[in-house]
């Protein structure tokens, strides 16, 4: 049904005809996410009519239908102004049961109405800066946080939980004040860590979480994203022991996330959000990643369980295949692995064994090839400064921040950027908590060491002799040309 016909029906005001018109419009446009310009004015008119009814109060019988139409039109940027008013937002917040009001809602809310209103709010907050501001002013985050805290006590449908969390994500992503409010005043890290634990469910110790079901995966990812937003600005500072305990507790849950698969091909996405959040934890709290007890089938190295580090490394390998948005893809996991390697010797030795195994092939440039080392060395000359820095930093830490060793594995040309940035061009080693980690040279490396070009990091083929096959006269002619060039230079 055309928006004009629906608007006309609304203006005549016969209830059944209106409802039928709205239902027909909803059916036709349930999957419309873009709208043609031809009917823009009709849609705007329809939006204005819907808003006037919304602000007066929708009839209980047909609320869901009206809200569905509002949801569809809230995807249309040209209709945003109509919906993004204080009264409209308040009405939607009331139907979503997240308005801060003096009088409590008398009867339990209708979940279908609640869900539709949440979806409308998500669309509006996503696309309208005015709606973002009004939602922040209306302190919707307070009631949303309150409801997230009720998930343990009361049963809410998956979709309601998901859109609660999605709205929290949008508000915290788009509004600094909401981020701070949720972080400080509403104890968001505690609240959402608890929600994450509830969502991950329980697995007996003998049978750790293996595959997270689809709905739980969706909710867990929204929680991880909200936690990322609220910890992004706040956590790099020093934390006291009780806060550190909370972040370590969160870290243990994230450890399970890294080790778990997600249903429906969403494992990499799930791990991506997990790794992003790990990167926000206070550095001293990352020790929980290596605190896993050894058990049958776990990967042991120097007496430590390396399952998590190995899973992060596998994740990095997967991410290195991607060509677009490389910074978002690899920087977080490289940062986490770098910090683990920096503070934990067994982790560093394990990662070095995997990433920088003893050099054998000394004839290929370090950046050429498909090994993890080659890919990371290639990143060291990437156009994006951050990508370049994290890749170099990771390899440098694996070399125990030893300049000669770093050059040995990456070549001086590739290493120069990081060394210059750190003022280490002359060699030496910066301050760091590294014991004298030995670096074992292979037979092949020892034999070729004298012939390796330190700039390229490989044995160069001897260039052909340019004088080969020249007559004595030709040689003399070339020599004279050279003398003339030097003569010009010295003038």
């Amino acid at each position: 049904m055309e928006p004009r016909a629906v608007a006309d029906a609304l203006e005549t005001g016969e209830e059944d005809a209106v409802t039928e018109a709205l239902r027909s419009f909803n059916r036709e446009h349930s999957q419309s996410f873009t709208f043609d310009d031809a009917q823009q004015e009709d849609r705007k008119r329809l939006a204005k009519l819907l808003v006037s009814v919304l602000e007066q109060g929708l009839s209980p019988k047909h609320r869901v239908t009206w809200l569905q139409t509002i949801r569809i039109l809230s995807r249309d940027r040209s209709c945003l102004d109509s919906f993004a008013s204080r009264q409209s937002l308040h009405a939607l917040a009331c139907y979503a049961d997240i308005a801060i009001s003096e009088e409590p809602i008398p009867q339990p809310p209708d979940m279908d109405v609640l869900l539709e209103s949440l979806k409308c709010l998500c669309n509006l907050v996503l696309s309208s800066p005015t709606a973002q501001m009004l939602a922040a002013e209306a302190r919707l985050v307070v009631r949303l946080a309150e409801r997230v805290g009720l998930y343990r006590k009361r049963s809410y449908p998956h979709e309601v939980q998901f859109f609660d969390l999605r709205l929290l994500f949008l508000l915290t992503a788009l509004r600094t004040d909401v981020r701070q409010q949720l972080f400080q005043e509403l104890h968001g890290v505690r609240l959402l860590t608890d929600a994450l634990e509830l969502t991950l469910g329980v697995a007996p110790k003998e049978n750790p979480l293996v595959i997270l079901p689809a709905q739980e995966t969706e909710r867990a990812m929204e929680i991880l994203k909200v936690l990322f937003n609220i910890t992004y600005d706040s956590v790099k500072r020093e934390v006291d022991e009780e806060d550190a305990a909370l972040y370590r507790y969160l870290g243990t849950l994230l450890r399970h996330c890294v080790m778990a698969d997600a249903a429906g091909d969403r494992t990499e996405e799930f791990h991506g959000h997990t790794v992003n959040l790990l990167g926000n934890l206070p550095l001293k709290c990352l020790d929980v990643l290596l605190a896993l007890e050894l058990h049958e089938g776990s990967l042991e190295f120097m007496g430590v369980n390396m399952d998590v580090i190995n899973a992060l490394l596998a994740f990095l390998e997967k991410r290195l295949h991607q060509t677009h948005r490389l910074k978002e893809c690899v920087a977080p996991v490289l940062s986490v692995l770098t910090e683990c390697a920096r503070m934990h010797r067994p982790a560093r030795k394990f990662l070095k064994a995997q990433v920088l195994p003893p050099l054998r092939d000394v004839r290929t440039r370090p950046e050429v090839g498909d090994l993890l080392r080659n890919k990371l060395v290639r990143l060291m000359t990437h156009l994006d400064t951050d990508v370049k820095r994290v890749a170099a930093e990771f390899l440098f830490v694996l070399c125990s921040e030893s300049v000669p060793r770093f050059i040995k594995y990456t070549g001086y040309g590739n290493a120069a950027g990081l060394l210059a940035a750190r003022g280490l061009m002359a060699g030496g080693r910066p301050e760091g908590q590294y014991s004298e980690d030995e670096d074992t040279d292979t037979e092949e490396y020892r034999e070729a060491k004298a012939s390796i070009n330190p700039v390229t990091g490989r044995v160069e083929e001897k260039p052909p002799n340019p004088m080969e096959g020249m007559t004595e006269e030709q040689k003399e002619h070339e020599a004279m040309k050279l003398v003339n060039m030097f003569d010009k230079l010295s003038r």
Partner: nanobody, 114 residues
Framework: QVQLVESGGGLVQPGGSLRLSCAAS????????MAWYRQAPGKEREWVGS???????IYRDSVKGRFTISRDNARNAVSLQMNSLKTEDTAVYYC????????WGQGTQVTVSS
């Protein structure tokens, strides 16, 4: 209604051991993280250690290596095994849900004195 009941406290000499227990009701215990806290006379209540629903544990530095938290989901109970006790461990010990605290019980008194 959430209820948490701590027991097992008592008087013990320095270097001795005690095992505290906490029985929980009114919560879906197995999906909850749990923690032990303590409050010494004239001091703020402080966190001692936590256990996740997966059984992972975290402890405050001063009790690491001496205290062990475990849980029994079948009995809705969490316990705190305290070894090599010191006089500074004297306090009233409480258990609670974690990371969001729900309800504080009466606690159980632990006194370490020669």
């Amino acid at each position: 209604q959430v209820q948490l009941v701590e027991s097992g406290g008592g008087l013990v000499q320095p270097g001795g051991s005690l095992r505290l227990s906490c029985a929980a009701s009114g919560i879906i215990f197995r999906s909850n993280g749990m923690a032990w806290y303590r409050q010494a006379p004239g001091k703020e209540r402080e966190w001692v250690g936590s256990i996740t629903s997966f059984g992972d544990t975290i402890y405050r530095d001063s009790v690491k290596g001496r205290f062990t938290i475990s849980r029994d989901n079948a009995r809705n109970a969490v316990s705190l095994q305290m070894n090599s006790l010191k006089t500074e461990d004297t306090a009233v010990y409480y258990c609670n849900t974690y990371p969001v605290n729900s309800y504080w019980g009466q606690g159980t008194q632990v006194t370490v004195s020669s």
